[in-house]
């Protein structure tokens, strides 16, 4: 049975050019995270492997940095950045646990953060 | 190479508190659930906690709930546990153990003793 | 809970010649991701217990292949193509497939 439940930064946004933290947590549960991955709807971001460290895509990395934690900061943002963001965890012997944020890359200074909630 | 040690035990009275540590090296403690599994004299293993990477989720079995608190500090590398309102049956040699590779105790410590006597 | 029973409680071996552990269940330890999370461990007089096989038949790393586990559903088995005298210990099956994770009795293989 997978009683775990992950917790994220929700919906959040940031203004053009700057950077945002995206963080989930996993809890409720003692299972082994053997690894964690983000997605930008079908792409891989980066991977954090617990014996590996931390993997990010080439195409990417000249903008995402790893952490804090196991969370993934995104740097130089662009409008197109806007749209769902999913980490996902890999656990034995619970199996996969998904977390969704939605981030809006906006134009102006009117950025604000979303409440934090939780996806069972 | 993965290695844990195990200090802490000793002879205690009835009622009475002790508290178990576990020092890792060898890997990212960090990243790894560990346990407790006991193993009283002549008799065979049994899980005793379990706490997740973080800290922040624990597992215990009824014999134990509500007297045991496992927690770690992983700037240390250390796993503890803490025992209260020890009994008679509470007299073991204690592992602790750390998964890997599927495995939920793919690695042991060399095990403390502990004595709940009067 | 899941019961775990091992038999046979004792088991005296000739090196050389195999030898077989039973493990069951009392109810199935198949896990809803559809792993079945069957270990077996072996501890050796005045050691730790080792890891010898996991997820019912996969050798940890180092494990002699004479080690053998094979099963499914709630009846597991450990076998030994050929025992050696390095072989004799207690052996535990163990689940985590549900809370509480549980072991087996144990059973003690030791040289006739």
């Known amino acids: 049975m997978m009683t775990g439940t992950i917790e994220t930064t929700g919906n959040i946004s940031a203004e053009k050019g700057g950077s945002i933290i995206l963080q989930c947590h996993l809890s409720s549960t003692t299972a082994q995270v053997t690894q964690v991955n983000w997605e930008q709807q079908d792409q891989l971001l980066a991977i954090c492997n617990a014996d590996l460290g931390w993997h990010i895509s080439p195409s990417f990395k000249d903008r995402v940095a790893p952490g804090p934690g196991l969370g993934l900061t995104l740097q130089s943002l662009t409008v197109n950045d806007t749209g769902e963001y999913f980490c996902i965890y890999h656990t034995y012997p619970d199996g996969t646990y998904t977390g969704r944020i939605f981030l809006e890359v906006l134009e102006s200074s009117v950025a604000e953060h979303g409440a934090r909630f939780q996806i069972p | 190479e993965v290695q844990l040690v195990e200090s802490g035990g000793g002879l205690v009275q009835p009622g009475g508190s002790l508290r178990l540590s576990c020092a890792a090296s060898?890997?990212?403690?960090?990243?790894?659930?560990m346990s407790w599994v006991r193993q009283a004299p002549g008799k065979g293993l049994e899980l005793v906690a379990e706490?997740?990477?973080?800290?922040?989720?624990?597992y215990y079995p009824d014999t134990v709930k509500g007297r045991f608190t496992i927690s770690r500090d992983n700037s240390k590398n250390t796993l503890y546990l803490q025992m209260n309102s020890l009994r008679a049956e509470d007299t073991a040699v204690y592992y602790c153990?750390?998964?890997?590779?599927?495995?939920?105790?793919?690695?042991w410590g060399q095990g403390t003793l502990v004595t709940v006597s009067s | 809970d899941v019961v775990m029973t091992q038999s046979p409680l004792s088991l005296p071996v000739t090196p050389g010649e195999p030898a077989s552990i039973s493990c069951r269940s009392s109810?199935?330890?198949?896990?809803?991701?559809?792993?079945?999370?069957l270990e077996w461990y072996l501890q050796k007089p005045g050691q730790s217990p080792k890891l010898l096989i996991y997820?019912?038949?996969n050798r940890f790393s180092g494990v002699p292949d004479r080690f053998s586990g094979s099963g499914s559903g709630t009846d597991f088995t450990l076998k030994i193509s050929r025992v050696e005298a390095e072989d004799v210990g207690v052996y535990y099956c163990?689940?985590?497939?549900?809370?509480?994770?549980?072991f087996g009795g144990g059973t003690k293989v030791e040289i006739k």
């Open positions: 153990a750390r998964p890997g590779l599927g495995a939920w105790f793919a690695y």
């Open positions: 060898g890997f990212t403690f960090s990243s790894y659930t």
């Open positions: 706490i997740s990477s973080s800290g922040g989720s624990t």
């Open positions: 109810q199935s330890i198949v896990h809803n991701s559809g792993n079945t999370y």
């Open positions: 997820k019912v038949s």
């Open positions: 163990f689940q985590f497939s549900h809370v509480p994770r549980t």
